[in-house]
């Protein structure tokens, strides 16, 4: 049978001779050279050679365990004379013994990591890993220990795991953001003579909201003309925040000051500025300077940093309102005046008042816009604003006069303003009532006494406060011996009635009745109107057949058939 132990061979042999591996030996070998040893398998005849007589095996080349740790070969022993095997072909192993010839190598040449600023000591940052190609099962050649070469006192590394942690309290991004840490991995458990490799870890502190906004100045001053309409931007303020991104976002608000209602602040997210704008119309004459307290605050706060103080800052904004030469201002937006229609020329109706609102209080002159009073019915005292008539009025022609008065600064004619005047002409009883229409009626020859032949109505251009009250009567010259009577109905109408039985159209074909109509106002106005009554022949139904004069076309009045 074969007689050998497992073969071991030290890697990376540097001697000048071949490296002795071991001896193949059969117990059948008497040492007389009758046996021949043959080697086959991994590297046989090349890497490994055998003395066919003695069975001694040698390695011809320098071997690297990390390239190939085990070689599997086959051994044969044959009788030289017969060529027959004296031992069964057998497999054997040459195991390459490790030496510490490889340094640890990190999985990355450069690591990149982030950790929030102000993190607690011991906060995980990143884990680095180094591998060693040497045999981990034998000795400490592959036992890697990590240490920090650069980056203390800020960071530490766990020697066995390669976990990098923060090592210093209150690391402030605003003070320093980037750190370059160098980590060493050393084999042999870190002992002397161990091989080592290094890697660089670039660590960036990420931002947390640990800084409040701060105004670079405590007071800002802006100017704006009093004429600035609402929405006009007056100026911009900007607080700075040492943080970045969301943590540096700022919102502005007006928290106090007498300008609280007069101004707005709008946060512009693009620039993180506060834009002060006009909110309500300003008036230099009322208030020349406003003071606002403006606050800048972080909308995103981290509760754990609230102990550092409020995440807000205040500044005072002083707004100076600049005077603008303004036109005169009337005491009213519109004036309503009244005057009787019987007013004499140069009668004063009323007055308007306008003042220069500016501090200068420039004197004002008044005038009527003639485009609104083409007939020059009215005039104005340029000095005191009194309105008076320059022509006679007639309410029945025009009830309302709408005119415009202009107030102009004497020292600066460009500054003027206008106001509407509505002048109502009040009624005076200066018109007599008159018939509502021309009355021409007829009476049948066979008419009976007290028969209604016509109803009269009157109109009056006047407009008395308590309404019209007309009275009707026959004119005195016709009252006695008249063939007709007037019956006043007391409702502003009257009726003409026959006074006798029967009329003869051959005796009298036409009657002219003078009717007096009076109103009941002061002074009383009256007029006389004439009613023409024709006598006609009628049928037995009372329908007119013929009259002495030409036939009546569409006669007014009531049928006399009744």
């Amino acid at each position: 049978s074969w007689m050998w132990n497992q073969f071991f061979l030290l890697e990376e042999y540097t001697g000048s001779d071949y490296q002795y591996v071991g001896k193949l030996h059969s117990d059948q070998d008497r040492g007389d050279g009758s046996l021949k040893y043959i080697l086959s398998g991994d590297g046989a005849g090349d890497l490994f050679i055998i003395n066919e007589n003695t069975g001694d095996i040698q390695a011809t080349k320098r071997l690297d365990r990390e390239e190939k740790p085990v070689y599997i070969l086959r051994a044969q022993a044959i009788n030289r004379r017969t060529g027959r095997p004296v031992e069964p072909e057998s497999e054997f192993i040459i195991k390459i013994h490790d030496i510490n010839d490889n340094e640890p190598i990190f999985t990355k040449e450069v690591y990149t990591a982030t950790v929030p600023e102000m993190s607690d000591v011991g906060t995980f940052v990143v884990q680095v890993t180094a591998t060693d190609a040497d045999d981990p099962t034998y000795g400490n050649s592959a036992k890697v220990v990590y240490s920090i070469l650069q980056g203390q006192p800020y960071f530490s590394v766990e020697s066995e795991t390669g976990i990098i942690k923060t090592a210093l309290l209150n690391m402030d991004r605003e003070n320093r953001e980037q750190y370059q840490v160098v980590i060493q991995a050393k084999d042999m458990g870190g002992q002397m003579g161990g091989l080592s490799g290094t890697t660089t870890v670039n660590i960036t502190l990420t931002d947390v909201n640990d800084n409040p906004p701060r105004f670079p100045q405590s007071t800002y001053q802006f100017k704006t003309p009093e004429s600035s309409p609402p929405g006009t931007p007056i100026g911009r303020i900007k607080a700075s925040d040492a943080d970045v991104g969301e943590n540096a976002e700022i919102e502005y608000s007006i928290t106090d000051g007498e300008g609280l209602d007069m101004f707005d602040v709008i946060t512009d997210q693009e620039t993180q500025e506060g834009i002060i704008t006009v909110k309500k119309l300003l008036d230099f004459e009322k208030k020349k300077v406003y003071t606002l307290k403006v606050e800048a605050s972080n909308p995103h706060v981290e509760p754990r940093f609230l102990y550092l103080g409020p995440f807000k800052d205040s500044a005072t904004v002083r707004i100076v309102v600049e005077d603008v030469d303004e036109p005169p201002v009337f005491s009213k937006l519109a004036y309503i005046l009244q005057i009787r229609e019987d007013a004499q020329i140069n009668t004063t109706i009323g007055s308007v008042t306008a003042q220069d609102p500016d501090a200068a209080r420039n004197p004002v002159k008044y005038s009527v816009d003639r485009h609104t009073d083409m007939d020059r019915i009215f005039n104005i005292d340029s000095g005191n604003g009194s309105i008076f008539t320059s022509k006679l009025l007639d309410r029945e022609t025009l009830l309302w006069h709408n005119i415009t008065v202009i107030a102009t600064e004497i020292n600066n004619p460009k500054q003027s303003s206008r106001v509407p005047l509505y002048i109502k002409v009040l009624d005076v009883n200066d018109n007599a009532p008159e018939f509502a229409e021309f009355y021409e009626t007829f009476v049948c020859e066979k008419a009976k006494a007290d028969q209604l032949i016509q109803t009269l109505r009157a109109v009056d251009k006047d407009d008395p406060y308590s309404g019209h009250q007309f009275s009707f009567s026959l004119a005195p010259e016709a009252a006695s011996g008249s063939n007709f009577t007037i019956q006043d109905n007391k409702d502003n109408t009257a009726g003409i009635l026959t006074r006798k039985n029967g009329y003869n159209r051959h005796e009298m074909s036409t009657y002219l009745l003078p009717v007096v109509i009076s109103d009941n106002d002061y002074p009383v106005q009256s007029s006389t109107g004439t009613v023409t009554v024709r006598v006609c022949a009628c049928d037995h139904h009372g329908n007119m057949q013929s009259c002495h004069a030409e036939a009546l076309i569409h006669p007014t009045g009531l049928s006399t058939g009744a």
């Epitope: 600035s228 309409p229 929405g231 006009t232 931007p233 976002e249 919102e251 709008i266 997210q269 834009i275």
Partner: antibody, heavy 118, light 109 residues
Framework: QVQLVESGGGLVKPGGSLRLSCAAS????????MDWVRQAPGKGLEWVGR??????????DYAAPVKGRFTISRDDSKNTLYLQMNSLKTEDTAVYYC?????????WGQGTLVTVSS | DIELTQPPSVSVSPGQTASITCSGD??????AQWYQQKPGQAPVLVIY???ERPSGIPERFSGSNSGNTATLTISGTQAEDEADYYC???????????FGGGTKLTVLG
Amino acid sequence: QVQLVESGGGLVKPGGSLRLSCAASGFTFSRYWMDWVRQAPGKGLEWVGRIKSKANGGITDYAAPVKGRFTISRDDSKNTLYLQMNSLKTEDTAVYYCARGMTFLGIWGQGTLVTVSS
Amino acid sequence: DIELTQPPSVSVSPGQTASITCSGDSIGSKYAQWYQQKPGQAPVLVIYYNSERPSGIPERFSGSNSGNTATLTISGTQAEDEADYYCQSWDGQSTIRVFGGGTKLTVLG
């Protein structure tokens, strides 16, 4: 980095509808006012409308030519701006841009083409 | 609402100063902004708050605003400045955003 990307453009018949989207990234979308601006072929920029941030009431404003037909909305949880376009007319043909800003438009998308044609 | 009027085109030789105006009623009491747009691209803000320049915008771009006119000035104009320029105003109250009609800047040569 800060980015706006429009999508949803295409060919649509007059009277039809289309919904454009604008995906925002790289900034706190919810805090910003967002606008839609369009540009007809060979013409100038025309403002379409805006939606303010929720902090400013989420108010929408529109240009006269699109009022009553277009609706702007936002989904802050998805960082997305929308433009719903109804009753489309041929004169609505344009490249539609979404843009960020209040006083000025500092960030613009690349635009999406909407063609309204029969 | 305010109407903003721009000249349709402005030409300038390389190295010279180009001025583009934007007229509008009392625009000086509002904030004016300017956008640059090159063919096939989205607009880019070049001036905001009348005269502020965003980061990345060359110093040759400047702005002013007073009275009824806002002005964009490009000093030492370069070929790459050839583009359309639009003004826009903001007044804090107006609910609508208004753009000018745009000005085509041509750099000669």
